[in-house]
């Protein structure tokens, strides 16, 4: 079972691409988290 | 759940447009990018470039640009993929995905593909 | 030469394990780069499995069994898919894609046949 915290993750664009090591995450919540995260609830589990 | 929506199968001529459309339903388009990705029939993807939707910035792979468009319009969580004056090996399933990662997980999401025919 | 090479087809029993290679061309440093693996069945659209770097830089598809894995050969320049348990339903393609030059390159793609 994954542990996904929804405070404590940060976010990457999976599409912009990344200029070799430079890997940026984001900490503000994806827009569509929210509907997304629970959709799978075999693979990940939302820690309040 | 976040679903990306494609509009339907389209047949064209040689020398005009195609216009796909990417609506994102149970959930907005969001501010990750939308990639369009295309495949030819017994081929492998290739990525024809991306868009913002929140800025409506774009990328586009050198091979498409000048005949590629991206725009999205954010009123109706939708993006569009238009391909001008076609050929026949541009003869293709037509896909948007957009998607993003934590340090553990990657959630990517696709449409269902829309296949461009072009035939005189 | 192209940026990512893969070999055409493997077949391999239920079981077993399977490692798919992607190989990059010269010049090209496996270490330097990200390397993606998709899963394609007929009809479908492309899955995404994992990304692998190395072992403190990789990440899972949600929802993509713990028996799918990256790693890397370094002596090779190649990014290797490892699937573990070989099932029925890993039939498939599989492609790898890298970020490179400011664009999305894919791997021409394996076809994984599960004998028997």
């Known amino acids: 079972m994954e542990d996904f915290n929804m405070e404590s993750d940060s976010f990457e664009d999976f599409w912009k691409g990344e200029d070799l090591s430079n890997y940026s995450y984001s900490s503000t919540l994806p827009p569509f988290l929210l509907d997304a995260a629970p959709c799978e609830p075999e693979s990940l589990e939302i820690n309040k | 759940q976040v679903q990306l929506v494609q509009s339907g199968a389209e047949v064209k001529k040689p020398g005009s447009s195609v216009k796909v459309s990417c609506k994102a339903s149970?959930?907005?388009?969001?501010?990750?990018?939308i990639s369009w990705v295309r495949q030819a029939p017994g081929q492998g993807p290739e990525w024809m470039g991306w868009?913002?939707?929140?800025?409506?910035?774009?990328n586009y792979a050198q091979k498409f640009q000048g005949r590629v468009t991206m725009t999205r319009d954010t009123s109706i969580s939708t993006a569009y993929m238009e391909l001008s004056r076609l050929r026949p090996d541009d003869t293709a399933v037509y896909y948007c995905?957009?998607?993003?990662?934590?340090?553990?997980?990657?959630?990517?999401?696709w449409g269902q593909g829309t296949l461009v025919t072009v035939s005189s | 030469q192209a940026v990512l090479t893969q070999p055409s087809s493997l077949s391999a029993s239920p079981g077993a394990s399977v490692s798919l290679t992607c190989t990059l061309r010269s010049g090209i440093n496996v270490g330097a780069y990200r390397i993606y693996w998709y899963q394609q069945k007929p009809g479908s659209p492309p899955q995404f499995l994992l990304r692998y770097k190395s072992d403190s830089d990789k990440q899972q598809g949600s929802g993509v069994p713990s028996r799918f894995s990256g790693s890397r050969d370094a002596s090779a320049n190649a990014g290797i898919l490892l699937i573990s348990g070989l099932r029925s339903e890993d039939e498939a393609d599989y492609y790898c894609?890298?970020?490179?030059?400011?664009?999305?390159?894919f791997g021409g793609g394996t076809q994984l046949t599960v004998l028997g």
């Open positions: 894609a890298i970020w490179h030059s400011s664009a999305w390159v």
């Open positions: 149970g959930g907005t388009l969001s501010s990750y990018a």
């Open positions: 868009i913002n939707p929140n800025s409506g910035g774009t």
């Open positions: 995905a957009s998607g993003f990662c934590t340090r553990t997980i990657c959630f990517v999401y």
